[in-house]
């Protein structure tokens, strides 16, 4: 907290300019009018204020706007944004995508901080949904943003926004999140032809049900093993050996390397050994000839 002292004669700031960087903290507090600062915030980021001086500027704005800064100030905060606490940011009403971009730019290249998370939350709540432009912006700065949202929050993503999603944006999503995103992606890409559709839908397939996987197996998609391993176990289990063979195409050989891992392991346990043998991969653990597994839940519990 800076002491309240009178501004020395001739030092009263008429405008926000570079001469102010040589003011002591108390001079800055005494000689810069908060209203002047607020109206000339666009100049602040171009002036190399010292670390301590930024604290003084924040203090002045806090006094002027105890209920929260107006957007005209927020969009020009620059490095001052990094002096804000989540509590400060909760008081803001940010509606402009340009303001959001300006503040995200300040934190660019760093992990999402509590301040940024609060800012995004305020912005998205203000908009009512995650529209395409917002999603474009957020995933450009934070590729993992989508996967940081709860399934409930993801439900507000309109299918049209899915076009903005890149495969790397889904890297850290769990099955519950993909369950929400997959139907939206299916809707978004429904008018694409087979091969183009598969390229787009591939990253979302961790949320696909069995019937969609069966349909894909009829389309010569040649799914890679990395994608197959991310499929829901409950969606893979009902697939026949022939369907998995068609689904994977030339990648079917990769099953051998993954036979001890889910969902491949669990899928093998559900197949007749005879059928598995037709693949010629040496997969073991299928149901022996003449056996009938009745209690499937017990079978899974034992495995």
């Amino acid at each position: 907290e800076v002491e309240k002292t009178a501004c020395p004669s001739g030092k009263k700031a008429r405008e926000i300019d570079e001469s102010l960087i040589f003011y002591k903290k108390w001079e800055l507090e005494a000689c810069v009018d908060a209203a002047l600062l607020a109206t000339q915030m666009d100049r602040v980021n171009a002036i190399p204020f010292t670390y301590e001086q930024l604290d003084v500027l924040k203090h002045k704005l806090d006094e002027l706007y105890p209920q929260g800064y107006p957007e005209s100030v927020i969009q020009h905060l620059g490095y001052l944004f990094l002096k804000m606490s989540p509590e400060d940011i909760r008081k803001w009403n940010v509606t402009s995508l340009e303001t959001l971009k300006a503040l995200l730019e300040v934190n660019k290249g760093h992990e999402m901080s509590p301040q940024v998370a609060t800012l995004i939350d305020r912005f998205v709540k203000g908009r009512g949904q995650l529209d395409k432009d917002t999603l474009d912006t957020l995933t450009a700065f934070y590729p993992g943003y989508l996967c940081s949202l709860s399934p409930e929050e993801l439900s507000s993503v309109p299918p049209s926004s899915i076009w903005a999603v890149r495969p790397q944006d889904l890297d850290t999503c769990d099955p519950r999140q993909l369950d929400v995103l997959y139907p939206k992606a299916r809707l978004a890409f429904q008018n694409m032809n087979g091969s183009e559709y598969f390229v787009k839908i591939q990253s979302f397939l961790g949320g696909a049900p069995t019937e969609d996987l069966k349909a894909l197996s009829q389309q010569n998609v040649s799914m890679d093993l990395a994608t197959f391993m991310k499929l829901r176990t409950d969606a893979v289990l009902p697939l026949t050996v022939a369907e998995v063979q068609k689904l994977l195409g030339p990648h079917v050989e990769g099953l051998k390397a993954e036979e001890r891992h889910r969902p491949v392991r669990d899928w093998i346990l559900r197949q007749r050994q005879d059928d598995l043998d037709t693949l010629g991969l040496g997969l073991q653990g299928g149901i022996p000839n003449g056996y009938l597994v009745l209690d499937l839940s017990m079978q899974e519990a034992l495995s």
Epitope: P48, Y51, Y79, N107, G109, H110, E111, V116
Partner: nanobody, 119 residues
Amino acid sequence: QVQLVESGGGLVQAGGSLRLSCAASGSTSSINTMYWFRQAPGEERELVATINRGGSTNVRDSVKGRFSVSRDSAKNIVYLQMNRLKPEDTAVYYCNTYIPYGGTLHDFWGQGTQVTVSS
């Protein structure tokens, strides 16, 4: 994190010159502006000069025309060239910067280098 190491200080006669260096290491790509401060005995620390990534500089009025600041971006070194030194320039000179990290700003200082100007 950023490490700053100053050098080049010493004892010099009034009217003489010194060139201080500040070598930065660590997260130097995040640095925008470098600052030279000084602190005379019993006085408050004061800003002497600044230089930003683009090479724009600011120099305190009381040393303008005598002091200049420059940088060697390739070596991550900032210099403070001090000419026509006066006894009142006697102080410990510090290099400083701050960078964004983890959603906040972090302030970094060198250990300081003593400049003594005798009359």
